[in-house]
């Protein structure tokens, strides 16, 4: 059950009516109210398991629970995506799936969970203590990442027991940008509502734009907000660094999605029925996502924090428990 915060288009005021401020104060509270009501704290989970049939084959499963809509999932290994991790796969709900060796099969299991199977042979194969991370970019919560690994003592075919403490990281830009804006927005909304009691409400103008209104951009983080929070960073130590996958990564910029077959690009697939649950269209994300792919072109995925929804500040990261806590 994912709610999407649809935001009405901001219209220029009709001449001779309320004027710009009157109209903006009418629309903005609803925008902010929608965001205030739908915002929660997402949970991200990661499961790493070694397949009993192929001892060096891994399956990584990741899920996202939140009220927002997922716009991108990035799976990496060797650490978080923004902290030196190597991208294994990128899954977009509409534009499809891109994966790099040793990833064998990445797919949507449901609208909110994905799985990735890794090949077990060759120089770039993972080892038992490799850390795998999943980053979910969503609106309006921002970007959330959780990590997990398979303890060396695990029996093949069993998933990791809940003893290790994988990492969960919510990008500071996401947290500060979204939370800050929402907090400010909620306060501002209360202020507006209080002021509204003391004067008559302006008349609502009918919207003359298309019904597919753009989503509010209030969640794009400011540079100032990114620098404000500092959390202790614990490095992930992996004695088994993946091989550099230079040859596997295209450097072609945003058009790399275009090479996907169209049948792979549309819907998250269920494990039984591969076309069971289509994801609703998210046309309003296009401008943000175009920026994302442009960024991907400048910085190929394996070089670090390319393909993140928000710019990763060079600041520290938090070491967290197994449950996607921030």
């Amino acid at each position: 059950m994912r709610t999407e915060a649809q935001v009405p288009a901001l219209q220029p005021p009709e001449p001779g009516l309320e004027g710009a401020m009157g109209h903006r104060t009418l629309v903005l509270p609803w925008v902010l109210l929608t965001l205030c009501v739908t915002a929660g704290t997402p949970e991200v989970w990661v499961q790493v398991r070694m397949e009993a049939t192929e001892l060096s084959s891994f399956t990584i499963r990741c899920g996202f629970l939140g009220s927002g809509s997922i716009s991108l999932v990035t799976v990496s290994w060797g650490g978080p995506n923004g902290a030196g991790g190597t991208t294994l796969a990128v899954l977009h709900p509409e534009r499809g799936i891109r994966q790099w060796a040793p990833a064998r099969q990445a797919r949507w299991e449901t609208q909110s969970s994905i799985s990735l199977i890794l090949e077990g042979s060759g120089a770039s194969s993972p080892c038992a203590n490799t850390t795998f991370c999943c980053k979910f970019a969503s609106f309006p919560e921002g970007s959330w990442e959780a990590c997990g690994s398979l303890p060396p003592s695990s029996d093949p075919g069993l998933s990791a027991p809940p003893t290790p403490a994988p990492i969960l990281r919510a990008d500071l830009a996401g947290i500060l940008g979204v939370s800050g804006v929402l907090l400010f927005g909620c306060v501002y909304l209360l202020h507006l509502l209080r002021r509204h009691k003391h004067r008559p409400a302006p008349r609502l103008q009918p919207s003359r734009t298309s019904p597919q209104a753009p989503r509010a951009r209030a969640w794009a983080p400011s540079q100032a907000s990114q620098a404000a929070l500092h959390v202790p960073y614990a490095t992930i130590n992996t004695s088994c660094r993946p091989a550099t996958l230079d040859t596997a990564h295209p450097h072609g910029g945003p058009s790399w999605w275009a090479s996907l077959p169209t049948h792979a690009a549309h819907r998250p697939q269920g494990p039984a029925a591969w076309a069971s649950t289509p994801i609703p269209a998210r046309g309003s994300f296009v401008s943000v996502e175009n920026g994302l792919y442009a960024q991907a072109g400048e910085r190929p995925p394996h070089t670090g924090p390319g393909l993140t929804l928000f710019p990763d500040p060079r600041g520290p990261r938090a070491m967290e428990g197994p449950l996607g806590v921030r």
Partner: antibody
């Protein structure tokens, strides 16, 4: 070992409020989400919501949004659920549970029995 | 909300039997299902997560299977201590939802 110790039986009057507690021990409290679940006599389980002990972030079942308020006290490793405007429909056993890897409730409290009666 | 339907409220079995408890989701939940056992007057106990992974300490006579919308908890060689109520739960999306439960009774 991991334990979730819930507060004892509560008998309250309709319209009143009550605050149930869930004290965690045997693990790092701030590393695991705490969930709350309701079970009415002879009935199934209903998810109320969850809380992230490290920052107090919450998610609620829409059905319980105006009924329950979840909080934590990190210093005492305790999670709380305040239930307000109580009616007989709120009479139930309330469980707190820890979310384990990758996602299931690996440890549960013993449950708090709440009876709302005049 | 995703509805998890356990169509059989009660199931009769005998010690040593093999029994299958079923659960059906109203929409695709992938493998994001857990199973719990609850005995009268006790808290639920986790048996299976990710549809088929046994929780630590759970006897191997308990086995979960299924994906998408159809899930099964199979208890082979039923023991007297297995007579309890069994709940499925989806964790694919909020709100998390449970099945209504299936009570395992002696024939």
């Amino acid at each position: 070992q991991v334990q979730l110790q819930e507060s004892g039986t509560e008998l309250v009057k309709p319209g009143a409020s009550v605050k149930l507690s869930c004290k965690a021990s045997g693990y790092t409290f701030t590393s695991y989400w705490i969930h709350w679940v309701k079970q009415r006599p002879g009935q199934g389980l209903e998810w109320i919501g969850n809380i992230n002990p490290s920052n107090g972030g919450t998610n609620y079942n829409e059905k319980f949004k105006s009924k329950a308020a979840l909080t934590v006290d990190k210093s005492s490793s305790t999670a709380y659920m305040q239930l307000s405007s109580l009616t007989s429909e709120d009479s139930a056993v309330y469980y707190c549970a820890r979310r384990g890897l990758p996602y299931f409730f690996d440890y549960w409290g013993q449950g708090t029995t709440l009876t709302v009666s005049s | 909300d995703i509805v998890m339907t356990q169509s059989q409220k009660f199931m009769s079995t005998s010690v040593g039997d093999r029994v299958s408890v079923t659960c059906k989701g109203s929409q695709n939940v992938g493998y994001n299902v857990a199973w719990y056992q609850q005995k009268p007057g006790q808290s639920p106990k986790a048996l299976v997560y990710s549809a088929s992974d046994r929780h630590s300490g759970v006897p191997d006579r308990f086995a979960g299977s299924g994906s998408g919308t159809d899930f099964t908890l199979t208890i082979s060689n039923v023991q007297s201590e297995d007579l309890a109520e069994y709940f499925c739960q989806q964790y694919n999306s909020y709100p998390l939802t449970f099945g209504a439960g299936t009570k395992l009774e002696l024939k």
